[in-house]
Amino acid sequence: MEVTVPATLNVLNGSDARLPCTFNSCYTVNHKQFSLNWTYQECNNCSEEMFLQFRMKIINLKLERFQDRVEFSGNPSKYDVSVMLRNVQPEDEGIYNCYIMNPPDRHRGHGKIHLQVLMEEPPERDST
């Protein structure tokens, strides 16, 4: 299984961020067997906190840090397990992991996104 995510995602403070995570598999998605975990890490060697799961249905774990700002925006049948994070704050900076199991595929897919929160719009690059 191959997972596609952006290595880094730069998001403006206060805006909404789509954390994209897509995968390809030799097998169609069977919702009874398919599983998904999204986790958050504050730093590279910090422990992971799970904030969203898919086990036949989406389970939003309502981590205190995200309150009600996370929602599932993907479609597993279309190999898309992306999530939306609303009103991004500096406290949201860190590492977001998506883990995917799609039996009978035996390999667990893993995507890692480094989220950086920008405090202001970056200056436009001179194209000349």
């Epitope: 504050e42 730093c43 950086q116």
Partner: nanobody, 116 residues
Framework: EVQLVESGGGLVQAGGSLRLSCVTS????????MNWFRQAPGKEREFVAR???????YYAESVKERFIISRDNAKNTVYLQMNSLKPEDTANYYC??????????RGQGTLVTVSS
């Protein structure tokens, strides 16, 4: 790998001042932003201040006009000067760093207690 070590915390009376330091070591050349966060017992972490490589600074509303973040690149150190401290500033203060490659690092923190 980057290491961050904070110091300068302690017990201070309301209205007093403290200066926190965060020394970075290891591969520090690609660090783009340095932040101070704080976490009070039983609460989520809270952003305090940020300084970019270019020296731009940003503050949480709750500390504006009272706290000043600065950096000394020659000493690989970021400072947080905290003035007019209030009891609600009591927390573990820790620094974090982000690299150009998107890696995130954090220190263990230094405890600040403000008594009334």
């Amino acid at each position: 790998e980057v290491q961050l070590v904070e110091s300068g915390g302690g017990l201070v009376q309301a209205g007093g001042s403290l200066r926190l330091s965060c020394v970075t070591s290891g591969r520090t050349s690609d660090l783009s932003t340095m932040n101070w966060f704080r976490q009070a017992p039983g609460k989520e972490r809270e952003f305090v201040a940020r300084i970019t490589r270019r020296g731009s600074t940003y503050y949480a509303e709750s500390v504006k006009e009272r706290f000043i973040i600065s950096r000394d690149n020659a000493k690989n150190t970021v400072y947080l000067q905290m003035n007019s401290l209030k009891p609600e500033d009591t927390a573990n203060y820790y620094c974090t760093a982000a690299s150009e490659m998107g890696y995130h690092y954090r220190g263990q923190g230094t405890l600040v207690t403000v008594s009334s």
